[in-house]
Amino acid sequence: APTSSSTSSSTAEAQQQQQQQQQQQQHLEQLLMDLQELLSRMENYRNLKLPRMLTFKFYLPKQATELKDLQCLEDELGPLRHVLDLTQSKSFQLEDAENFISNIRVTVVKLKGSDNTFECQFDDESATVVDFLRRWIAFCQSIISTSPQ
């Protein structure tokens, strides 16, 4: 029969695991919100700002199904920042853009871990910034929907 100490340690492990899952869920929801906010701002100013933004090429992973694949998103945050620099002026202040990218980077690292040994396999086909954001939004939604509640 299990001792009370082994029972309590397995309970503590289960609680810790549940806590980690909750944190992961919160980080995913935060990332999803940030990506949706970026896309929404771009679409709100579409005639003024999108033409210039759509000249930038982004690259998506061949396949993205796990949190480690967020390395591919992290790799593209530099180019994303360049695009956001274009949106400063009336629609999007520069410090706002810096903040967004910084927040996304922090959230991504929390989700995928700080180990950078995983090398992203990018698709050969490029995507516009709108398609890029939509694809990562769909990725977050997919992981959230399949996560144990």
Epitope: N47, L50, R52, L54, T55, F56, H82
Partner: antibody
Amino acid sequence: QVQLVQSGAEVKKPGESLKISCKGSGYSFTSYWIGWVRQMPGKGLEWMGIIYPGDSDTRYSPSFQGQVTISADKSISTAYLQWSSLKASDTAMYYCARETLAAVGSNYYYYGMDVWGQGTTVTVSS
Amino acid sequence: SYELTQPPSVSVSPGQTARITCSGDALPRKYAYWYQQKSGQAPVLVIYEDSKRPSGIPERFSGSSSGTMATLTISGAQVEDEADYYCYSTDRSGNFWVFGGGTKVTVL
């Protein structure tokens, strides 16, 4: 249909000022960027700059910054390119062109400059 | 300032394939657009976003891009394709547009 109609040919002397125009019709003039392109005799196309008539946000090519002024009057759907003091080297064909961003369903397609004016010939000679 | 480099001329026999290249340091991250300009006429867009064809442009026109090079291909060139072709893209910042020097295509 969507069209850009430019003002007629101009013959000027060095040092004179000039303002040529580009009138848009068949679309919402304030919602699309309009660019200006120079083509000197027998030479290639050169991008000069661009304006968003909705709020007059203007970008110039570094090569043309300070040499010309791009403006727009949204009340009459017209964009302008002007010089305060012409030089013989300004002799060229000048085109205005509209940048097109199309939304098809939830997808966006950016066509670059796909609607062009007929061009305005500017000759500067003493 | 940013530059796009094209060959000055390309010759092709009718029915053969003509390839026009355009090189620029920013092209791995920026889309290329291609214009056709026939003598005495305004330019016409033939390819956008590297490889997409606007409606009304014949299927023999196609575009591709790899690294710092974009390519316009005319498969089965016809006499009416004789024109100057310009690539067009933005600099790294995305604020300024640049045309390539243009390529004169002769269909002999």
